[in-house]
């Protein structure tokens, strides 16, 4: 677990479902119970006892993670899915997202790669073996978020509630905004992005930015090299 990990309320990704006692501190604008506090604006808070984050697709996880059932390697299987640590070189895989950055999935094995822009969700062909035991469904993490009384014919606009990025229109991704996940714009060149340097730290951010758009990568801004590690600015840059 990560203890007292610093979170920036204006940075992003997904807040885990914490367990345990109630949060609260005098003077805070809002209590996020259990275990989390949030004050609006550019304030920093700590969050203890990191818990795995439920996910629906790889894009919802950190760059060093992929989305899968804990007892199985591949996403898309029925049952609870969480963000799992990426697989290192020479480990077995079923798709590129399972391999750690700088690697890709080739013939069921994570191999070193000179290019790190393969589509995250691409399934590696020719794999017939499962990577683990089947996991039963019915865990309470639904695979779709649709109204039972309505069929959606249009993709979500900015500000529409979503479960996964495929629910959103082109140019948008499904990202957390406090207690819901909504369609937000995919980041353009030069826009500030979130680079998750600490393992699992993506799970502590309550306002999630989208990932960088096609052909872009989240990299440290050149003129910020000299600043301290904790405050280095990352932006979407051309590969």
């Amino acid at each position: 677990t990560l203890n007292s990990v610093l979170i920036n309320s204006n940075a992003i990704k997904n807040l885990p479902p914490p367990l345990g006692g109630a949060g609260g501190q005098p003077g805070s604008a809002v209590s996020v119970a259990p275990g989390v506090l949030y004050e609006g604006g550019n304030k920093y808070q700590t969050l203890d006892n990191y818990q795995p984050y439920p996910c629906a697709e790889d894009e919802e996880c950190g760059t060093d993670e992929y989305c899968s059932s804990p007892s199985r390697g591949a996403a898309g299987v029925g049952g609870v899915q969480i963000c799992l640590a990426c697989r290192k070189r020479r480990k077995r895989c079923m798709r590129h997202a399972m391999c750690c950055p700088g690697n890709y999935c080739k013939n069921g094995i994570c191999m070193p790669s000179d290019h790190s822009h393969l589509p995250r969700g691409e399934i590696e062909e020719g794999i017939i073996e499962n990577l683990g035991n089947d996991h039963g469904a019915g865990d309470g993490y639904p695979r779709r978020t649709t109204l039972t009384s309505k069929i959606y014919h249009t993709k979500g606009q900015e500000g529409s509630v979503c479960l996964r990025s495929s629910d959103c229109a082109t140019g948008l991704c499904c990202a957390r905004h406090f207690w819901s996940k909504i369609c937000k714009p995919v980041l353009k060149e030069g826009q500030v992005c979130t680079k998750h340097r600490r393992k699992g730290s993506h799970g502590l951010e309550i306002f999630q930015r989208c990932y960088c758009g096609e052909g872009l990568a989240c990299r440290i801004q050149k003129d910020h090299h000299q600043t301290s590690n904790s405050s280095r600015l990352h932006t979407c840059q051309r590969h």
């Epitope: 604008a29 809002v30 609006g40 978020t145 714009p185 306002f207």
Partner: antibody
């Protein structure tokens, strides 16, 4: 059809407790965030509490004005939302609405409200 | 917390007229390319109804005469031609930051 029906309001003395319920239907209840919003007589709207849906771990959220006194909870098997209100004050007198965000990041579906009166 | 100030407090108009309601935030409610401002209509004895979300997008089943505009701290709800059923109280709400806050409301009454 999406429906939210509140119940449990009534007259209670200062310092007393009350539990409100909201019965939901017409949508996959567990998947969505759902909230309580109140409106004091002749006044505006005030957010009271929210709980996220399955994908975000059913986290709960409160403003300072009710923190430590009110508890929001949900029973997904019963498609029900609750608000346990303790240490009630005169200023808690209001119509309490449950509201959910099904399509947009807003309160896009509301119940009809239940009235809570705190008075001696 | 973000404070929303609505003006005017009361707007007296006749059916068929154009209504322009203002909502000003104490700080920007824009983030991630979205204006986190919503507009609701409330009639006496009824629950609020969502009209506009994300600053300018229409809620489900909302007539085209209702439109929202603005960015940053200044937002406007426009009713292009008032119908008899539009006379009500209108609230703006911000959802950029928690706690979500509402404006004090603008009452649109028949002149």
């Amino acid at each position: 059809e999406v429906q939210l029906v509140e119940s449990g309001g009534g007259l209670v003395q200062p310092g007393g407790s009350l539990r409100l319920s909201c019965a939901a239907s017409g949508f996959t209840f567990s998947s969505y965030a759902i909230s309580w919003v109140r409106q004091a007589p002749g006044k505006g709207l005030e957010w009271v509490a929210s709980v996220s849906g399955t994908g975000l771990g059913f986290q709960t959220y409160y403003p300072d004005s009710v923190k430590g006194r009110f508890t929001i909870s949900r029973d997904n098997a019963k498609n029900s939302l609750y608000l346990q209100m303790n240490s009630l004050r005169a200023e808690d007198t209001a119509v309490y609405y449950c509201a959910t965000s099904l399509e947009n990041y807003a309160f896009d579906y509301w119940g009809q409200g239940t009235t809570v009166t705190v008075s001696s | 917390e973000i404070v929303l100030t609505q003006s005017p407090a009361t707007l007296s108009l006749s059916p068929g007229e154009r209504a322009t309601l203002s909502c000003r935030a104490s700080e920007s409610v824009d983030d991630f390319g979205i204006s986190f401002i919503n507009w609701y209509q409330q009639k006496p004895g009824q629950a609020p109804r969502l009209l506009i979300y994300a600053g300018s997008k229409q809620g489900s089943g909302i007539p085209a005469r209702f439109s929202g505009s603005g960015s940053g701290t200044d937002f406007t709800l426009t009713i292009s031609s008032l119908e008899p059923e539009d006379f009500a109280v209108y609230y703006c709400q911000q959802l950029k930051e928690v706690p979500p806050t509402f404006g004090g409301g603008t009452k649109v009454e028949i002149k």
